[in-house]
């Protein structure tokens, strides 16, 4: 079974979570207008 998200027991969902998408600057220029 795959790893779960969206629960406090998961380390990826801990309070250290920035909540931010990657938003890489080198990719933004490729986005469709």
């Amino acid at each position: 079974s795959e790893t779960t998200t969206g629960t406090s027991s998961n380390s990826s969902q801990s309070t250290s979570n920035s909540g931010l998408a990657p938003n890489p600057t080198n990719a933004t220029t490729k986005a469709a207008g």
């Epitope: 969206g6 990826s12 801990s14 309070t15 909540g19 931010l20 998408a21 938003n23 933004t28 490729k30």
Partner: antibody
Amino acid sequence: QVTLKESGPALVKPTQTLTLTCTVTGYSITSGYTVSWIRQPPGKALEWIGYIQYTGSTRYNPSLKTRLTISRDTSKNQFVLTMTNMDPVDTATYYCARGTTASFDYWGQGTTVTVSS
Amino acid sequence: DIVMTQSPLSLPVTPGEPASISCRSSQSLLYSSDQKNYLTWYLQKPGQSPQLLISWASTRASGVPDRFSGSGSGTDFTLKISRVEAEDVGVYYCQQYFIYPLTFGGGTKLEIK
């Protein structure tokens, strides 16, 4: 248990300013995550409005940026969305949702806002 | 902005049968730094708020039945339901959680035949 709940006026007039509040329970809004505002016009898809991070920093959708302010009240564990110059096309259900680094994992129930004279 | 395109628009399915929803993005959602695809799936049941199903293209959220699975990479993604149940009705949305502004697909309405 994490919960988010939106509140605000159901009806606003064109050109008026909309103020919505998102009250969070189950975690401290200064401890992590972002909270985004997302809207959904009747029968249509979802549109991301903007977020406020646990640090207080904000980011807005460029299509709405000039009309938006997202702020917070840490003492009340609340976020506030202010949208100026409302128009009938802004009629929608407005949601607040907690953002992780990969998704919106908790959503509010939504509040329906109608813009009409 | 990244454009998210879903198909089909409507999906009538017989209970117990499989279902598949496609989502395409106008640019790659694969982040080179961590090799993850920042593609998320949500289900909005009638009269309810959206709920998280799958993040990082294939990681099921807590409590989501294993009949739901996500796959794909880059710009082409798929949500599959192995055996549709009556409770699965609603509108399915894909979303890119990669570059701001975050954007959603137009939705796929799953209905029971």
